[in-house]
Interface confidence: medium
Amino acid sequence: QRLPRMQEDSPLGGGSSGEDDPLGEEDLPSEEDSPREEDPPGEEDLPGEEDLPGEEDLPEVKPKSEEEGSLKLEDLPTVEAPGDPQEPQNNAHRDKEGDDQSHWRYGGDPPWPRVSPACAGRFQSPVDIRPQLAAFCPALRPLELLGFQLPPLPELRLRNNGHSVQLTLPPGLEMALGPGREYRALQLHLHWGAAGRPGSEHTVEGHRFPAEIHVVHLSTAFARVDEALGRPGGLAVLAAFLEEGPEENSAYEQLLSRLEEIAEEGSETQVPGLDISALLPSDFSRYFQYEGSLTTPPCAQGVIWTVFNQTVMLSAKQLHTLSDTLWGPGDSRLQLNFRATQPLNGRVIEASFPAGVDSSPRAAEPVQLNSCLAAGD
């Protein structure tokens, strides 16, 4: 599905096959400004959760060396946001003995803030991106990724963790967001919907895309994920929207073709190394950036989100495979695994390009309501 405004020169226009081509302490709100944990009832908006390297058993992330193997990152315990009470629940709850944060389900109790108080923070993710209100920031230069083109060996772990499909990444994938802001990629995972129902986490002017990829990074300033949680810029996520296109995306096919092997919750397989950057849009120069949070408990804030303007195209069959192959806990399909959008609460989303320029003939002068404070080269 594409909105009429999704043209090549407008924000989020022009898809990419992807083949060739990151606030201080937790700020808990008062009752009146608590972020909503669910969208108003609507068929597109069943919220879900995020998957990140775990808190329980976090290994040290050592400096890169040629001898190191893959990081063995366990899943972060997650809790799902309540869904629309009118909708059937897609997942049952999951228990992990002695671990409060792993007891979760779509819809109903427990409320997220009870599981992790940070989930009631003022600066949460995902958010709705409104390009017209984004602050054009020329200092946001093209993203640079290093070492994302992986050889077939060593193979990588692809896992159905019950709430997403996650690919654990080896050491050596580096990403830079600016001066002194260097990151190592840890893992990537996807969020999706169900048949005929989109499932991206972020939205653009209320429009939800079919799916979304997240590549999760740890700042090189921290040796462990648990040290970085809640620290400004401690974690950074690259996010891209997945859309339907006419052709099969060969990069994604390398993962999607293996989903049947991990249909059961908790199952995993090994896949050959691949070009991770090919899973992202080819245009690294046009993106939105804001500071938010993990999209599941512990909902730690200080996460730098970079959302690409360009989308990635997958075929209809591929999107169907993504949303219709995996199973979650309790004989339920793993679908609609996204959290509701959260209020900005005064945050400004920055854009690396003039996203607020309306291409329609009605706009004589582009209105830029917000300004960028970042420094350049």
Epitope: D21, P63, A176, G178, G180, E182, S277, G376, D377
Partner: antibody, heavy 119, light 107 residues
């Protein structure tokens, strides 16, 4: 004004050692990725070693791995390259370079220090 | 390792004319390419990064284009100070590699 000044080069016999230094000024050194690049006569520029802003990530060219060690002292605004077991093929002009605002392309280079390995 | 091949090795151009320098990567490097200028006895100077972005202070006559495996540096109207060697470099994957260079000389 950004300045990078290399020192420590010279003539050394095969198997010998040298320690190159790069003194940086005019910018917040601790924010920047830094590299050593060499240029031998009639040969291509070659990235020898790189180090991220906090020193936690290092890279070495395969042919120097185990022989060269890159390090930095952010308190002293200095970058170093300890070169051991030097070979004739290490003869080159060695440049210290700063990476553009933490990224991977190099925006400032020193004037270089010459290393000659010969018996 | 990714091999960067520059052509031509030497380009003879008259001042005021346009110069087009080519750089081909042996595999896809997306847009992770930089262009440098080096004059005799001097260190390299960054002109272009991310394939098409002019670095701060670089004159508008220098432009970069391309993605994937084929890249071009164009100097729209050569000035006397532009006669030098030009190198492309990929920084998509280690080892970062440079092209062999194109020497732009006065015709």
């Amino acid at each position: 004004e950004v300045r990078l000044v290399e020192s420590g080069g010279g003539l050394v016999k095969p198997g010998g050692s040298l320690r190159l230094s790069c003194a940086a000024s005019g910018f917040t050194f601790s924010n920047y990725y830094m590299s050593w690049i060499r240029q031998a006569p009639e040969k291509r520029l070659e990235l020898v070693s790189a180090i991220n802003s906090d020193g936690g990530i290092t890279y070495y060219l395969d042919t120097v791995k185990g022989r060269f060690t890159i390090s930095r002292d952010n308190a002293k605004n200095s970058l170093y390259l300890q070169m051991n077991s030097l070979r004739a093929e290490d003869t080159a002009l060695f440049y210290c370079a700063r990476h553009r605002s933490g990224y991977f392309s190099m925006d400032y280079w020193g004037q270089g220090t010459s290393v000659t390995v010969s018996s | 390792e990714i091999v960067m091949t520059q052509s031509p090795a030497t380009l003879s151009v008259s001042p005021g004319e346009r110069a087009t320098l080519s750089c081909k990567a042996s595999q896809n490097v997306v847009s992770a390419v930089a262009w440098y200028q080096q004059k005799p006895g001097q260190s390299p100077r960054l002109l272009i990064y991310s394939a098409s972005n002019r670095y701060t202070g670089i004159p508008a006559r220098f432009s970069g284009s391309g993605s994937g495996t084929e890249f071009t540096l164009t100097i729209s109207s050569l000035q006397s100070e532009d006669f030098a060697a030009y190198y492309c470099q990929q920084y998509r994957n280690y080892p970062w590699t440079f092209g062999g260079g194109t020497k732009v000389e006065i015709k």
